[in-house]
Interface confidence: medium
C-alpha cells in the first residue's frame, strides 16, 4: 500500500510514542528525563507538561525531530532534577493541533530508601 | 561507584564486524539517554549515536548510518554499538556517555575501548 | 550540520596565567553549547554545560560565556593540572558536533 503524504491526509492525527518506560523508578536525589516522541498532522499547536494539575512553564522543551519542511515527527523532554520522595506520581504530556487531541501519562516513583535499588 | 566500562574492542580487517558493550553501574540507567563518541588517533572527539532510554528512539552521525546499529538492554545495564562493514577510517578508541538535562550535555564518561580496523 | 570552529587550536602557558578559548558556531545554537577538559590517555570530563553553568565538583577557576554563535571558555589562573585539550560541542541539533579541539600546553 502506497505511503500517504502529509498533505494527502483528510483527518489530522497525533500518535505518541513514549521513548522511557511510562513506569520509572528512580532513586531520591537522582534525575530522569521523560521523553516522548509523536507524530502529528496538522502541525502540533499546543504542547504542555502537567503533574498535580500543574502546568510546567520551564523544565522541558519541544522540538522538531527532523528539519525538513515534510518533518510531521517531534520530541517532547520533560527534564526533572534531583527528585525528592514527595515529587512521586503522575506526569502527563498533552499535545493538540487542530483536529485532535492527545496525552500520555508517566508513574514516577522515587525510591527514599537509604540503600538506592538500581533498576 | 558510578561509573561507565566498556569493552569488545580490538583489531579488525576491512569489511568485518565488531560489537562493544558499555556496561554502567551506580545509576538507573534505564532513566538515561546513552550515546557514544569515537576518537581516532591523535584527533578530535566525533559523535557518533544516541539512543533514548527506553531504546525505542536512534539517531546517527552520516559517517555511520546503515553500518552501525545502537541499542541497549536495560535489564543488564548495557549499552552496545554493532559495528559492521568496518573501514580503517573507524579506527578509534570509542567512549560510551551519559546524556543529561535540557542542555543535552554528557556528565559521565567511560575510559573508552580501542578499535583498529587494518589489514 | 552545524560546523563548530575553535581558536586558537593550541597555545602555550604558564601557571597563573589566564587563558581564554573561543568557540564560533556556523549558526545559531543559543546556549546550547557544552565544554569538555580531556587531559592525554583519559576520556573527556564535563566542564561547563549550558554555555555558562559550571558543572558540579569543576573548580571555579573556569568559567564559560556566550550565546547565539559565539562563546568563551576562561580559565582565570591557569594550574598544572589544566594542561588538556578543551573542547566545545554544540547539543542545538542531532548531531552533536564538537569543535576539532584546543590544546593548552605548557610555555
Known amino acids: 500500500q502506497p505511503s500517504v503524504s502529509p498533505g494527502e491526509v483528510d483527518k489530522g492525527f497525533i500518535n505518541i510514542f513514549p521513548m522511557i518506560n511510562t513506569t520509572v523508578f528512580v532513586n531520591d536525589g537522582e534525575n530522569v528525563d521523560l521523553i516522548v516522541e509523536y507524530e502529528a498532522f496538522p502541525k502540533p499547536e499546543h504542547q504542555q507538561w502537567i503533574y498535580m494539575n500543574r502546568t510546567f512553564t520551564d523544565k522541558w522543551e519541544d522540538y522538531p525531530k527532523s528539519e525538513n519542511e515534510s518533518n510531521i515527527r517531534y520530541v517532547s523532554e520533560l527534564h526533572l532534577t534531583r527528585l525528592k520522595g514527595t515529587e512521586g506520581g503522575t506526569y502527563t504530556f498533552l499535545v493538540s493541533n487542530s483536529d485532535v487531541n492527545a496525552a500520555i501519562a508517566f508513574n514516577v516513583y522515587v525510591n527514599t530508601k537509604h540503600h538506592h535499588h538500581h533498576h | 561507584e558510578v561509573q561507565l566500562l566498556e569493552s569488545g574492542g580490538g583489531l579488525v580487517q576491512p569489511g568485518g564486524s565488531l560489537r562493544l558493550s558499555c556496561a554502567a553501574s551506580g545509576f538507573t540507567f534505564s532513566n538515561y539517554t546513552m550515546i557514544w563518541v569515537r576518537q581516532a588517533p591523535g584527533k578530535g572527539l566525533e559523535w557518533v549515536s544516541r539512543?533514548?532510554?527506553?531504546?525505542?528512539?536512534?539517531d546517527y552521525a552520516d559517517s555511520v548510518k546503515g553500518r552501525f546499529t545502537i541499542s541497549r538492554d536495560n535489564s543488564k545495564n548495557t549499552l552496545y554499538l554493532q559495528m559492521n562493514s568496518l573501514r580503517a577510517e573507524d579506527t578509534a578508541t570509542y567512549y560510551c556517555?551519559?546524556?543529561?538535562?535540557?542542555?543535552?550535555?554528557?556528565?559521565?564518561w567511560g575510559r573508552g575501548t580501542l578499535v583498529t580496523v587494518s589489514s | 550540520d552545524i560546523q563548530m570552529t575553535q581558536s586558537p587550536s593550541s597555545l602555550s602557558a604558564s601557571v597563573g596565567d589566564r587563558v581564554t578559548v573561543t568557540c564560533r558556531a556556523s549558526?545559531?545554537?543559543?546556549?546550547?553549547l557544552n565544554w569538555y577538559q580531556q587531559r592525554p590517555g583519559k576520556a573527556p570530563e564535563l566542564l561547563i554545560y549550558a554555555a555558562s553553568s559550571l558543572q558540579s565538583g569543576v573548580p571555579s577557576r573556569f568559567s564559560g560565556s556566550g550565546s547565539g554563535t559565539d562563546f568563551t571558555l576562561t580559565i582565570s589562573s591557569l594550574q598544572p593540572e589544566d594542561f588538556a585539550t578543551y573542547y566545545c560541542q554544540q547539543s542545538y541539533s542531532n548531531s552533536r558536533t564538537f569543535g576539532q579541539g584546543t590544546k593548552v600546553e605548557i610555555k
Open positions: 539512543i533514548w532510554p527506553s531504546g525505542g528512539g536512534t
Open positions: 549558526q545559531n545554537i543559543d546556549n546550547y
Open positions: 556517555a551519559r546524556r543529561v538535562g535540557a542542555s543535552r550535555y554528557f556528565d559521565l
